[in-house]
């Protein structure tokens, strides 16, 4: 039985140009996480594998680092960034479990960051 | 004992292609990520690929993609490395490698095959 | 991607010497360091992974340290078979990586 939560960031704004820190976190289960995917949509952003590290997708290379932790930063923020993010732990013996977490990039200098949020 | 033993290497013009294999023994085959590693004559080592331990998925160089296509028979304990468009800097000593696993290293090497690229 | 320099490319040093290898990364990569050894016409062996653990069956006069960028191999007590070429390889990002290589050579 999957026992384990998703906490993640939730809804977070940032502005345009900026960088913003995407942060997931598995909990109340002892499952060994062997990858997260980072996804917007249905494109992968980047993985990080346990056995073989982080893998940042060519065309995100650019704008994408690791961390921290398995966490995501993404730097130089267009208006297009602005939609759903998934982080999908892999684990083993569970299975997996799936985060979400929605970035509105602004135009102005008003982003506030959303109240963290949990995912059975 | 471990065991990696690579087969498939040879002399092929540019533009060609080539399959390597390495047979694996001694250990559970299918519960591992496999890699191949190559070194050019006289040169340092370079990753060129890696399978997931099921097959599912597959990562490579910047330099062999489009042109390498890494692939495994876990019912065979075997892995491939089908190489198309082969061209004059792919010559080099080609390696399967097996990870100590979660160290991020490679701690067992076949012998290497030998592969060059020459018209 | 990520580079690794190792310096420096060729030491010359006796049976007794303590010899410092060292490996710099373009980007930190944590403790996600390997170091090889490497004699020829034979493949790598492993001596050191997490940039500080010894492999099983490795002489102890081997030891690595460092993290972040900056890593280092020693031998604390040449040995003749230790006369070879060693590569650093890092881990924290695909593509894995590999040094230059550092020759050990007969002073």
């Known amino acids: 039985m999957m026992t384990g939560t998703i906490e993640t960031t939730g809804n977070i704004s940032a502005e345009k140009g900026g960088s913003i820190i995407l942060q997931c976190h598995l909990s109340s289960t002892t499952a060994q996480v062997t990858q997260v995917n980072w996804e917007q949509q249905d494109q992968l952003l980047a993985i990080c594998n346990a056995d073989l590290g982080w893998h940042i997708s060519p065309s995100f290379k650019d704008r994408v680092a690791p961390g921290p932790g398995l966490g995501l930063t993404l730097q130089s923020l267009t208006v297009n960034d602005t939609g759903e993010y998934f982080c999908i732990y892999h684990t083993y013996p569970d299975g997996t479990y799936t985060g979400r977490i929605f970035l509105e990039v602004l135009e102005s200098s008003v982003a506030e960051h959303g109240a963290r949020f949990q995912i059975p | 004992e471990v065991q990696l033993v690579e087969s498939g290497g040879g002399v092929v013009q540019p533009g060609r292609s080539l399959r390597l294999s390495c047979a694996a023994s001694g250990f559970t085959f299918g519960s591992y990520y496999m890699h191949w590693v190559r070194q050019a004559p006289g040169k340092g080592l370079e990753w060129v690929a890696v399978i997931w331990p099921d097959g599912s998925n597959k990562l490579y160089a910047d330099s062999v993609k489009g042109r390498f296509t890494i692939s495994r028979d876990n019912s065979k304990n075997t892995l491939y490395l089908q190489m198309n468009s082969l061209r004059a800097e792919d010559t080099a000593l080609y390696y399967c490698?097996?990870?100590?696993?979660?160290?991020?290293?490679?701690?067992?090497w076949g012998q290497g095959t030998m592969v060059t690229v020459s018209s | 991607d990520i580079q690794l320099t190792q310096s420096p490319s060729s030491v010359s040093a006796s049976v007794g010497d303590r010899v410092t290898i060292t490996c710099r990364a373009s980007q930190g990569i944590s403790s996600w360091l390997a170091w090889y050894q490497q004699k020829p016409g034979k493949a790598p062996k492993l001596l050191i992974y997490g940039a500080s653990s010894l492999q099983s069956g490795v002489p102890s006069r081997f030891s690595g340290s460092g993290s972040g960028t900056d890593f280092t191999l020693t031998i604390s007590s040449l040995q003749p078979e230790d006369f070879a070429t060693y590569y650093c390889?890092?881990?924290?990002?695909?593509?894995?990586?590999f040094g230059g290589g550092t020759k050990v050579e007969i002073k």
């Open positions: 490698a097996k990870p100590v696993p979660k160290s991020r290293a490679l701690d067992v």
């Open positions: 390889q890092q881990a924290f990002y695909l593509p894995w990586t």
